[in-house]
């Protein structure tokens, strides 16, 4: 092809090429043609004769102002036609008359101000029609019943002011899963406008200034329709009362989105008419007081999003939002509750009472004063089968004994990004009989004891990154009870002392993060008592991160037991010479990172076993000695291997000898070297 299109598997991508005409030299069997972001002004039908197999044509982001009806005659198999961001202003009965197999027609962002006559009447198979971002002043798309298979009608960002049955009843035989009318200036819902549609399942009116009064009228118009999903985000619904959603009593609504409404007052029984509701989005509002009956009637809600719904009005403590006790008691089916990023004063004794199916609760950054977790804090969750609890970013400084004793079903507890500073006696976790993961990373300090985790033997993941960990070298090890542990993160703790039995018995451990500590002394031969073999027995370890520990020595047998190791990161250390057989047992190794060390020589006797099955190697920024003895074997291996070696050309540079300084390692000439073949 003389054009710079890329062709792969019957797909031609000719986008962003400044084309002024359709290429005439592409393979005739292409089924998908992308001509977006060019300078096409016309689409002459004759130019498509050779591409009769096309099922998808995308000519978005051009300057097309007119479409030849004959285009689709040349493309009898066309299913998807995308004309978004062009300059179409008028559609006639003929424009798409031959596009009878279309399932998607995208006309968004053109200049179509009015649909005259019946330009879509032949699209009997159309599923998606996108007319968003045009200048349409009405929903009138035709004068007779049509588009019987349409499922998505997208009319957002137009100038529609009223919904009228005489315009919408051309959809009398359609089942619309999505009627998208967001970002219009709708001020009127004429009687019967939604009943004119055969079946309407989803209505989206985001960014429409409805307010409480028009919302009430809307809901009355939706009575006795098939509506399931209703989205009213950012619709200036500042208050709700027990009549706002009355009309929805005669529907089976399952999803309601009231987010971004600056909703201030949620009156009692506002949602009493929605017993079928399952998904309720209330995030980004301004609720000042949740009354005990505000949520009454929501017996079937499974998902409730209250993120940033309760925010304080001023600095004054008196202006903090209030949640009455038992406010959530009606939500018998609630499984997922998001209350992130709020300004709730604290957890009251009956705050969550009645949530008998709650499995996921996010309270991240939810409270203004939750400094201490006591044995009363979560009493209202005693009868909730909670699996996941997120308590991050709450400035929690202390966890008292039995704080979680009510949460016997809990599997994941996230306490990260707080200010916890205490000795962990182990009593904090009493009752967590099913715990799977505890995330404690990014806290103030944690002092471990032999019993810190004695009561949570089921724990499989423990995250203790950057918590100024103390007493990690106590004996017996604080981790000894954690026989089921598969992930342990002890990184960023400046740990200098650990015992060789710290991880003893953790035979299921798969991921161990020890990066950014100070473990260098432990592997020195000069260490009093010899090197500390703290990795012994970890026969199922898959990932080991030892980056940034200052290591300048590696004991020869330190990785001896790590038969299943797949990834090892030793980057940003001070390693120079590695013992000959150090990687001999790493037959499963897939990724090796030794970047930014002091390695000068990459010899077969050291690296041969490690490189055998490698898929990724990172040895960037090492001061390679470009001599036959040091790197001939490595260079030959590089040039034969299929291993991915990022930035090989630019970041693998010779340091010595001087005349090779700055020279790319891979270009080192090995032809004069003896016995340097990488594979035998």
């Amino acid at each position: 092809s003389t054009t710079k299109c890329t062709v792969s598997h019957e797909v031609a991508d000719c986008s962003h090429l400044k084309l002024t005409q359709v290429p005439d030299d592409l393979p005739t069997n292409i089924t998908v043609l992308n001509l977006t972001h060019n300078q096409l002004r016309r689409l002459p039908a004759a130019n498509f004769t050779r591409y009769s197999q096309l099922t998808s044509l995308d000519v978005g982001f051009n300057t097309i102002s007119k479409l030849e009806p004959e285009l689709c005659q040349k493309l009898p198999m066309l299913k998807v036609l995308n004309l978004q961001h062009n300059e179409l202003s008028q559609l006639s009965d003929k424009t798409f008359a031959f596009c009878t197999n279309l399932t998607e027609l995208h006309l968004m962002s053109n200049s179509i101000q009015k649909i005259k006559n019946n330009p879509f009447v032949k699209q009997k198979n159309l599923i998606t029609l996108d007319l968003s971002h045009n200048g349409l002043s009405s929903t009138k798309l035709g004068t007779q019943v049509q588009l019987e298979n349409l499922q998505e009608l997208l009319l957002s960002n137009n100038k529609i002011q009223a919904l009228k049955s005489e315009e919408l009843d051309i959809f009398a035989n359609s089942s619309l899963k999505k009627l998208e009318l967001s970002s219009n200036q709708i001020k009127e819902f004429s009687p019967g406008c939604f009943h004119a549609i055969g079946r309407l399942f989803g209505l989206f009116l985001n960014n429409v200034q409805l307010g409480p009064s028009l919302t009430e009228k809307l809901c009355l118009e939706l009575a006795n329709t098939s509506i399931r999903n209703l989205s009213l985000s950012n619709s200036q619904l500042s208050t709700t009362s027990n009549t706002t959603f009355l009309g929805l009593k005669w529907t089976n609504l399952t999803m309601l989105d009231l987010s971004y409404n600056n909703l201030n007052v949620v009156g009692n029984d506002s949602f009493a008419w929605l017993p079928q509701l399952e998904y309720f989005f209330l995030e980004y509002n301004n609720i000042q007081h949740l009354f005990s009956h505000s949520l009454h009637g929501l017996f079937n809600v499974r998902y409730l999003n209250l993120k940033r719904s309760f925010t304080k009005q001023s600095i004054s403590l008196a202006s903090l939002p209030k949640i009455d006790d038992f406010s959530f008691q009606w939500l018998k089916c609630l499984e997922h509750l998001n209350m992130e990023d709020n300004d709730i004063p604290g957890i009251k004794s009956n705050m969550f009472t009645g949530l008998i199916n709650l499995k996921y609760l996010s309270l991240s950054n939810s409270f203004t004063s939750l400094r201490t977790l006591t044995n009363e804090t979560f009493v209202s969750l005693a009868h909730s089968p909670l699996h996941i609890l997120n308590l991050t970013k709450n400035k929690i400084s202390k966890i008292e004994s039995d704080a979680f004793s009510w949460l016997g079903h809990l599997e994941v507890l996230d306490l990260g990004l707080n200010e916890i500073g205490q000795e962990l006696t182990g009593q904090e976790w009493r009752g967590l009989e099913n715990i799977f993961e505890i995330y404690l990373s990014y806290n103030k300090y944690l002092q471990l004891t032999r019993n810190s985790f004695a009561l949570v033997p089921s724990l499989q993941r423990l995250m203790l990154r950057r918590v100024a960990l103390k007493n990690v070298d106590s004996s017996p090890s604080p981790f000894q009870p954690l026989r089921n542990l598969t992930i342990l993160d002890l990184s960023n703790n400046n740990i200098a002392n650990i015992n060789d039995d710290m991880l003893e018995g953790l035979e299921k451990l798969e991921i161990l993060d020890l990066q950014h500590n100070n473990l260098a002394r432990l592997w020195k031969h000069a260490n009093p008592g010899g090197p500390i073999y703290f990795l012994k027995g970890l026969s199922h370890l898959h990932i080991l991160n030892l980056e940034s520990n200052g290591f300048d020595e590696i004991p020869v047998e330190v990785f001896k037991d790590l038969f299943e190791l797949k990834i090892i990161d030793l980057g940003l250390n001070n390693l120079n010479t590695l013992p000959a057989s150090v990687f001999n047992n790493q037959v499963s190794l897939k990724s090796l990172n030794l970047q930014k060390n002091l390695i000068t020589s990459v010899e077969k006797k050291v690296f041969g076993p490690a490189f055998r099955n490698l898929t990724e190697l990172d040895m960037r920024f090492n001061p390679f000695d470009c001599t036959c003895e040091s790197i001939a074997w490595f260079v030959n291996w590089i040039n034969e291997t299929h291993t991915n070696i990022p930035e090989l050309s630019s970041h693998y540079l010779c340091n010595t000898p001087p005349h090779y300084h700055g020279f790319p390692v891979r270009l080192f000439d090995t032809s004069s070297c003896k016995d340097s073949a990488p594979f035998e």
């Epitope: 003929k94 424009t95 006559n117 007779q144 049955s165 009843d169 009398a172 009943h195």
Partner: antibody, heavy 122, light 107 residues
């Protein structure tokens, strides 16, 4: 086979109301694949469209600007027919009146009534 | 609104080709229908949607439409084709717009 049978008086006095009926056989006036209308032809003159009715969720009509203030076309679903009423007639309304079936989607007339000559005279 | 203009009359010798034009601004983007009317009879649809022929209409009738002109073509014109011919289209809210009609005379 669709047939349209017209009926109605052939003589109407000025200022009175012209009323014609078009009975349909072989199709339904409530069909959503066709529309129904009236056309007239003054002696020695061309065809003039008067109006149309079509059924979607309810009945809709469109009338020619020249007669809009005086015309009504109504369906009668029980008798499967539709009618034309033209008020305040004058001698200029003397013409042969045809009822017609408009075929979707582009409103070609595939069936015509036999035509009724209506004379407006005192 | 669309306006359709036809020549008042067209003459053709038997067996020759008659062409009747119907002009209108951008008529090519509208569908045009053609009706034949013989004296004392109701009109009959001879071409619909520019070029489609209803069943029972002889093959000598054909139509085309592009730009500002639609054309009805009768090839091998016969005496029985002598009649008035009307072009028609629709443009909401006027669901029918007729041309003024053309009298076809077979010499």
């Amino acid at each position: 086979q669709v047939e349209l049978q017209q009926s109605g008086p052939g003589l109407v006095k000025p200022s009175q109301t012209l009323s014609l009926t078009c009975a349909i056989s072989g199709d339904s006036v409530s069909s959503n694949s066709a529309a129904w209308g009236w056309i007239r032809q003054s002696p020695g003159r061309g065809l003039e469209w008067l109006g149309i009715i079509q059924k979607r969720s309810k009945w809709y009509n469109n009338y020619a600007v020249s007669v809009k203030s005086r015309i009504t076309i109504n369906p009668d679903t029980s008798k499967n027919q539709f009618s034309l009423q033209l008020n305040s007639v004058t001698p200029e309304d003397t013409a042969v009146y045809y009822c017609a079936r408009y075929s979707y989607p582009f409103y070609s007339i595939d069936y015509w009534g036999q035509g009724t000559l209506v004379t407006v005279s005192s | 609104d669309i306006e359709l203009t036809q020549p008042p009359s067209v003459s053709v010798a038997p067996g020759q080709t008659a062409r009747i034009s119907c002009s209108g601004d951008n008529i090519g983007s509208y569908y045009v229908h053609w009706y034949q009317q013989k004296p004392g009879q109701a009109p009959v649809l001879v071409i619909y949607e520019d070029s489609e022929r209803p069943s029972g209409i002889p093959e000598r009738f054909s139509g085309s439409n592009s730009g500002n002109t639609a054309t009805l073509t009768i090839s091998g014109t016969q005496a029985e084709d002598e009649a008035d011919y009307y072009c028609s289209s629709y443009d909401d809210p006027n669901f029918q717009v007729f041309g003024g009609g053309t009298k076809l005379t077979v010499l």
